[in-house]
Amino acid sequence: MMTGTIETTGNISAEKGGSIILQCHLSSTTAQVTQVNWEQQDQLLAICNADLGWHISPSFKDRVAPGPGLGLTLQSLTVNDTGEYFCIYHTYPDGTYTGRIFLEVLESSVAEHGARFQIP
């Protein structure tokens, strides 16, 4: 039975040219996290594997940085980065948990950054 829940940063906005941290946190389960995938719509951005560490997809290497923790930092944002992002936690024995974040990249300087949190 899957008892865990994923907390995310929810809906967030950021300024064009800036950077943003996408953060998810899996709680209420003792399942072992074997891998976390970060995806944008159908594109794989990055993987953090428990044994192999981080792997950034080649097409995003210049604009994506690993961390903090199991989160992902997006840099040099463009309006095309607006959209849904998913953190997919592969766990044993529970299975897969998915969290959703919606990012809006704004042209103006009045972008309000959503609440962020760090994984302890």
Partner: antibody
Framework: EVQLLESGGGLVQPGGSLRLSCAAS????????MGWVRQAPGKGLEWVSA????????YYADSVKGRFTISRDNSKNTLYLQMNSLRAEDTAVYYC??????????WGQGTLVTVSS | DIQMTQSPSSLSASVGDRVTITCRAS??????LNWYQQKPGKAPKLLIY???SLQSGVPSRFSGSGSGTDFTLTISSLQPEDFATYYC?????????FGGGTKVEIK
């Protein structure tokens, strides 16, 4: 006792192919990620490739991407490295190693691959 | 890719000496830093993982420290069997990369 035994090395001409094997024993092979590391004569260590425990994820150094393929057969406790379009700069001792929590914890004795005409 | 720079590339020391080898990463790698020992004609052997954890069976005279970009391997009292080449390796992000090695020779 953990044992990793590489085989399949040898002399091959530039442009040729080789398949290296690594037979594992003494540990739960199917639960471990595995990798290949090479060492050119008189040089340092270079990571070549890695594969997740299930075989579903494979990763390569840029220097071998598109030419080398890592795979595994968990039913045979064996890791493979298919090497195509070999170049002189691929000449090295190739080590297979088990990977646990981001470290190479056990290594084979290595097999020498020589690419020369 | 993350570049790993080891220093010195070689050193001469005597039995009983305290030896320090440093490794610098071109970007922060948290504590995902491993150290290996290699003797001529042999496979590398894991000494230290995660910056400071001693691999099972490795003598306690070996220790590791550091975080971020700067790391150190220390041999508190060099023994005859410690003359070898030592490599650092980052495992924060693929591709995993090694330092160029430090050869510890007998003075």
């Amino acid at each position: 006792e953990v044992q990793l035994l590489e085989s399949g090395g040898g002399l091959v001409q530039p442009g040729g192919s080789l398949r290296l094997s690594c037979a594992a024993s003494g540990f739960a092979f199917s639960s471990y990620a595995m990798g290949w590391v090479r060492q050119a004569p008189g040089k340092g260590l270079e990571w070549v490739s890695a594969i997740t425990s299930s075989g579903g994820g494979t990763y390569y150094a840029d220097s071998v991407k598109g030419r080398f393929t890592i795979s595994r057969d968990n039913s045979k406790n064996t890791l493979y490295l298919q090497m195509n379009s070999l170049r002189a700069e691929d000449t090295a001792v190739y080590y297979c190693a088990s990977i646990r929590e981001r470290r190479f914890d056990f290594w084979g004795q290595g097999t020498l691959v020589t690419v020369s005409s | 890719d993350i570049q790993m720079t080891q220093s010195p590339s070689s050193l001469s020391a005597s039995v009983g000496d305290r030896v320090t080898i440093t490794c610098r990463a071109s970007q922060r790698i948290s504590t995902y830093l491993n150290w290996y020992q290699q003797k001529p004609g042999k496979a590398p052997k894991l000494l230290i993982y995660g910056t400071s954890s001693l691999q099972s069976g490795v003598p306690s005279r070996f220790s590791g420290s550091g975080s971020g970009t700067d790391f150190t391997l220390t041999i508190s009292s060099l023994q005859p069997e410690d003359f070898a080449t030592y490599y650092c390796q980052q495992s924060y992000i693929i591709p995993w990369t090694f330092g160029g090695g430090t050869k510890v020779e007998i003075k």
